[in-house]
Interface confidence: low
């Protein structure tokens, strides 16, 4: 898991004669916004192919009005980063598409008009966790300067964000058996094994063999509720004597407010104060409407024409997410039967079947028993791509070729004596028991417990099991 971040530094007329003076048409003022699209791999892809790694839309920039006779400036840009979260591994090679859009604010019928001003495409190799990469690109008569990077989030590290690491509360040496996750010297791979019995819910450890308690819990294994804890209200580790610790991160740690929002703590939660143009619990929403084309991968946008109205993306088959930005993991439905391996090829699903199975979904069980004989009256049972023999009594082994002692498993209960017989076994029951395996006690009055003894059989008589 992680996030790709793009920072636009400047967008303006490129050098040389014939450069445009203004992005706005003659109809009046306009403002810019940007769309970023990420596609995996380095192949040349059609512009309309899905942004399979994700996409993001910036807020609108400040309104720009052309000043006659003034030198053509770099144009005013939207605030903040463009962020594209990715849930799986960072691919390392990708195509980056940055579109610059113009919103004209003149008196158009039907409200503002949008048009694509410039598009740049870069095919790049980039390791997650590295420094910002800077770039300058020309698109027609325009020049775009930007920086980008991919960084891991949550507990993921590594160039592909695939290794999980445990953040340490303070930079220090890792405990025995742990080594730092380069280049972050204050993180250690693999959580240590805590003291045996340490509460999973209320305890944790930073070194193997220890057990430290969260607020409200105490005791060597953090299983005792602390009615009056001396460290209540404190933030961070307390002394070892109190045996308690307020969970370190506060609600604003790591700043949950996106797009430059500022965070303030409220009881048990947080509140974001958002910059102009952003709102939502985490300032993650800009005033996006259907006119911005927020639905990716061919999604149909439904919503009001007025700029403040909400929108909904109706996604085509194979895509999901509020902006149809996520490809449906069709393999998660486990369509391949009988242990087949599922491969999502994009255009189709493919099942790679285990030996002994076939069909588009591995639904056909090949005849495992063809040409396989089970000896001594055994019957062949298909399953799992290999044949298995169900042997007649007195025989065992893979092909029922070995003689088996039916009494070896001591099948007669309650001290009954077992006799091997040509067609199976016979149990001679101890006094007080009956049944083919001596499993039923006999009541003292001579009436047996269920099931009743068959006619002609007295309790205690040997019974042959057929």
């Amino acid at each position: 898991a992680g996030v790709f971040e793009l920072q636009i530094h400047s967008f303006g007329p490129g050098p040389g004669p014939g450069a445009p003076r203004s992005p706005c048409s003659a109809r009046g003022p306009c403002r810019l916004f940007f769309r970023v699209c990420l596609k995996p791999g380095l192949s040349e892809e059609a512009a309309e192919s899905p942004c399979a790694l994700g996409a993001a839309l910036s807020a609108r920039g400040p309104v720009y009005t052309e000043q006659p006779e003034a030198p053509a400036p770099d144009l005013p840009l939207p605030n903040g980063l463009l962020q594209v979260p990715f849930r799986d591994a960072w691919p390392g090679t990708f195509s980056l598409i940055i579109e610059t859009w113009r919103e004209e604010l003149g008196d158009q019928i039907g409200g503002p008009a949008w048009s694509l001003l410039a598009r740049v495409t870069r095919r790049r190799r980039l390791a997650a966790g590295g420094p910002w990469a800077r770039d300058i690109q020309r698109a027609g008569a325009w020049e775009l300067r930007f920086s980008y990077r991919a960084r891991c989030e949550l507990l993921a590290v590594g160039t592909a964000c695939t290794r999980l690491c445990r953040p340490r509360s303070a930079p220090s040496r890792c405990g025995p058996g742990l080594r730092p996750c380069a280049p972050l010297e204050d993180e250690c791979e693999a959580p240590p094994v805590c003291r045996a019995g340490c509460s999973l819910e209320h305890g944790f450890c930073e070194q193997p063999g220890e057990c430290r308690c969260l607020e409200g819990w105490t005791g060597p294994l953090c299983t005792v509720p602390a009615s009056t804890s001396s460290c209540l209200g404190l933030r961070g580790p307390s002394s070892a004597t109190t045996g308690c610790l307020v969970p370190g991160p506060g609600p604003c740690d790591g700043n949950p407010c996106a797009n430059g929002g500022s965070c303030s703590e409220t009881p048990g939660s947080f509140e974001c104060t958002c910059p102009r143009g952003f709102y939502g619990l985490r300032c993650e929403v800009s005033g996006v409407t259907c006119a911005d084309g927020p639905c990716f991968n061919g999604g149909l946008c439904v919503g009001g024409a007025d700029p403040d109205s909400a929108y909904i993306c109706h996604c085509p088959p194979g895509f999901q997410g509020s902006n149809c930005e996520k490809r449906v993991d069709r393999c998660s439905l486990q369509p391949c039967r009988n242990g087949g391996l599922c491969l999502d090829l994009g255009h189709a699903l493919r099942c790679r079947c285990r030996a002994g199975f076939a069909g588009p979904r591995c639904e056909h069980n090949l005849d495992d028993c063809a040409g396989r004989a089970c000896a001594n009256g055994g019957t062949c049972v298909e399953g799992g791509g290999a044949h298995r023999c169900s042997c007649a009594l007195g025989f065992g082994g893979r092909d029922c070729r070995e003689r088996a002692d039916p009494c070896a498993a001591r099948p007669c209960a309650h001290g009954g004596r077992c006799y091997a017989h040509f067609s199976g076994l016979v149990c001679a029951c101890a006094p007080g028991y009956m049944g083919s395996r001596c499993e039923f006690p006999v009541h003292p009055d001579g009436v047996s417990a269920l099931p009743a003894a068959p006619p002609g059989l007295r309790p205690g008589d040997p019974q042959r099991y057929l």
Partner: nanobody, 125 residues
Framework: EVQLAESGGGSVQAGGSLRLSCVAS????????MAWFRQAPGKEREEVAA????????WYADSVKGRFTISRDNAKNTVYLQMNSLKPEDTAMYYC??????????????????WGQGTQVTVSS
């Protein structure tokens, strides 16, 4: 067509409790803001509580903090409003609203795309 259906309204004495439910049909709950609004006769519609379905983060109007609790069951496409310690001034028609994406700034009730028909709550003293 997306539909929101509220239920659970009724009449109750001051200090009593009610639990409102809102079921969304033909609508998936991912990345959605679900909110409860209320409107008393002759007054403006006001937002009471909101919840973001992805992470369960909530918001409450000052007038109901500590008394009302909003929750959701994504598997059932349902959002609830548990109302305790009801007061006569809580009397209103209560509406459920849905909006894809996160919750907008307070007061932006026009940004909710879908609305239920409402359920009446009457609190007598």
């Amino acid at each position: 067509e997306v539909q929101l259906a509220e239920s659970g309204g009724g009449s109750v004495q001051a200090g009593g409790s009610l639990r409102l439910s809102c079921v969304a049909s033909r609508y998936t709950f991912s990345s959605t803001c679900m909110a409860w609004f209320r409107q008393a006769p002759g007054k403006e519609r006001e937002e009471v509580a909101a919840i973001y379905t992805d992470d369960g983060s909530t918001w409450y109007a000052d007038s109901v903090k500590g008394r009302f609790t909003i929750s959701r069951d994504n598997a059932k496409n349902t959002v609830y409003l548990q109302m305790n310690s009801l007061k006569p001034e809580d009397t209103a028609m209560y509406y459920c609203a849905a909006r894809r994406w996160a919750c907008p700034r307070v007061g932006s009730w026009h940004e909710f795309a879908y609305w239920g028909q409402g359920t009446q709550v009457t609190v007598s003293s």
